[in-house]
């Protein structure tokens, strides 16, 4: 913008100015209307100097000046006068050049600022955004890492609680375990004690035990020589009285029978007059060893040699070839025969097998062969059995044809397996069989479901096992 | 103690599907053969399908086969027998039994019934219009 201004400062000069956008100029003149008179030396209108001067050497030297100043005054007012008369002219003519040359220049520097300004901003634009961006992302990671983090932290709070508890709940059991600890061994010593005692009471027993046993077969076995020898002799008496109360007899004495007093089975001792049924002694055929079995004298007519019986687990059947070749167990309970035994036996006349089972129902069932026998050791006592008939099923439980004997340290059977080890107990197993009367024996409510239980299959079915069992064998000709 | 259990047993009619299931706990599977059995009323119980080493190997009677498919699912120890096509022959109570799987004749692929010690109680499948 421009603007031309006149106005009067301070000191009564008149002044003045030439505004043009921030630019301004003032022009300062001299009034000659404000000069004094004369009349005093010290009221010229003189230059004041800095000190007067003396008043002999300066009278001369005012008169001229005087006289220059009068000229001056008068120049000057003419000056002023042409001044004012073309200062409206010459004002207009200056603003006009001075604000043409500003504007020229003003435009010049303007553009180059706007030019500049413009080019400020544009980089200052970028780099707002830029920084925008830059905050924006940092604002959603900042967010995104306070979610993270207070996640985390909930977590780590929940981790801990739960540590807390299980650190309690550790803290309750272990103290628990100590005190189960602390009554179990205190439990587990009072048992010791009483194993201990009760090791001494049943070796004592045991020992009682067999003493009673041989005293009661000697005692049977007395018995039966006893009622022999009273049957001898009431037939001899008979036979003397006979004699006596004929008149026609001759003298003679009565041949008595040499005493039989060695059974090679329970059939023999049964036909020799006892019939009670109990523990015997048998001697194997063509030898003097002697065995210990359980007679049946009860069961369809007696003479029964009992082979195996099973009843309430005592015994443990899961045993070596040795021990089912030799025999186990007690005739009065649980016990194996023998196999040598047996095939020795079987090998020499013809015998029946009777198999007598018990189910845990109150249920009784047997199955009766009327030819069996077992090869010998170098056969692996293989089985041999025909004729069945009976109530235990239709169908032989025992496979046929006969599978050789196995046990836990002899696997003699047809099966990829080894059926001793699987269905425990030494037996005929085939692969592995619908029978094994040798298995665990299972109490009641245990005893279904069994994998290697007391299995007599064409009764029971598969998976049960039973109660008791007992196997015997006869002569066929009893 | 080792159980089976049988289930999806019910009446269909001829030409449908039916789907048994039995699971089974006190054994694993990897160790063991299942199979399914079937008995008609007044009949013989008579293996239908059997399943061992993973469902390596399975068997069919020859009156299913085509028809019926065994199959098994470790991780759950459960064994099933999809049976399609279902005939009014087919009516009977099927059961599941178990037998360890080493109990093998040599030579035999599969295993008589009465080597499945484990039976479940079985369920009734009634196949009429």
């Known amino acids: 913008y421009s603007n031309f201004r006149k106005s009067v400062d301070s000191t009564g000069r008149r002044q003045y100015q030439v505004q043009n956008g921030p630019c301004s100029y003032t022009f300062l003149l001299p009034e000659t209307d404000s000069c004094r008179s004369s009349s005093s030396p010290y009221m010229s209108n003189a230059v004041q100097r800095d000190a007067p001067l003396d008043y002999d050497d300066s009278v001369q030297r005012l008169q001229v000046l005087e006289n220059i100043l009068e000229n001056n005054t008068q120049w000057l007012m003419k000056l002023e006068n042409y001044i004012q008369d073309n200062m409206k002219k010459e004002m207009v003519e200056i603003q006009q050049n001075v604000v043409q040359n500003q504007t020229a220049v003003m435009i010049e520097i303007g553009t180059s600022l706007l030019n500049q300004t413009a080019a400020q901003t544009r980089k200052l634009t970028d780099v707002e955004a830029q920084v925008l961006n830059q905050t924006t992302r940092l604002e959603l990671q900042l967010l995104q890492h306070s979610i993270s983090t207070n996640k985390l932290e909930k977590q780590i709070l929940d981790q801990t609680s739960e540590i807390n508890k299980l650190q309690n709940k550790n803290s309750f059991l272990e103290q628990k375990v100590l005190d189960m600890e602390g009554k179990h061994s205190e439990q587990l010593q009072s048992m010791k004690e009483q194993k201990d005692e009760l090791q001494v009471l049943v070796s004592k027993q045991s020992s009682v035990i067999d003493e009673l046993e041989k005293k009661l077969v000697t005692a049977t076995v007395n018995n039966s020589l006893l009622q022999k020898q009273q049957h001898d002799l009431m037939e001899t008496v008979n036979s003397l009285l006979t004699m006596m109360s004929s008149p026609n007899s001759k003298s003679s004495v009565a041949i008595r029978k040499e005493e039989q007093t060695t059974f090679r089975d329970c059939a023999e001792i049964f036909k020799s007059g006892l019939t009670t049924s109990g523990i015997y002694t048998l001697t194997f055929p063509n030898s003097t060893e002697e065995i210990k079995a359980y007679c049946d004298m009860d069961v369809g007519g007696g003479g029964w040699t009992v082979i195996q019986h099973r009843e309430d687990g005592s015994v443990d059947f899961q045993r070596t070839w040795k021990e089912y070749k030799e025999g186990f167990g007690s005739p009065l309970g649980e016990y194996w025969l023998g196999n040598e035994f047996v095939s020795q036996l079987t090998g020499q006349h013809r015998y029946v097998l009777k198999i007598q089972l018990k189910d845990w129902e109150g249920n009784e069932a047997h199955s009766l062969y009327d030819h069996f026998y077992l090869a010998g050791e170098e056969s692996n006592y293989r089985i041999h059995l025909t004729g069945l008939t009976g109530t235990a099923g239709k169908i032989s439980s025992i496979s046929q044809p006969g599978s050789d004997f196995s046990t836990k340290d002899s696997d003699n059977d047809k099966c990829i397996c080894k059926c001793s080890q699987m269905l425990s107990g030494g037996w005929w197993f085939d692969a592995c069989g619908p029978s094994n009367l040798n298995g665990q024996y299972y109490p009641q409510k245990q005893n279904t479901n069994k994998f290697n239980g007391i299995k007599w299959y064409y009764w029971k079915g598969s998976g049960y096992s039973l109660k008791a069992t007992t196997m015997m064998i006869r002569p066929a000709d009893f | 103690e080792v159980q089976l259990v049988e289930s999806g047993g019910g009446l269909v009619q001829p030409g449908g599907s039916l789907r048994l299931s039995c699971a089974v706990s006190g054994i694993t599977l990897d160790d063991y053969a299942i199979g399914w059995f079937r008995q008609a009323p007044g009949k013989e119980r008579e293996g239908v399908s059997s399943i061992r080493d993973n469902g390596g190997s399975t068997y069919y009677a020859d009156s299913v086969k085509g028809r019926f498919t065994i199959s098994s699912d470790n991780s759950k120890n459960t064994v099933y027998l999809q049976m399609n096509s279902l005939r009014p022959e087919d009516t009977a109570v099927y059961y599941c039994?178990?037998?360890?799987?080493?109990?093998?004749?040599?030579?035999?692929?599969?295993?008589?019934?009465?080597?499945?010690?484990?039976w479940g109680q079985g369920t009734l499948v009634t196949v009429s219009s």
């Open positions: 039994a178990a037998v360890p799987a080493g109990r093998l004749r040599y030579g035999e692929q599969w295993y008589p019934i009465y080597e499945y010690d484990a």
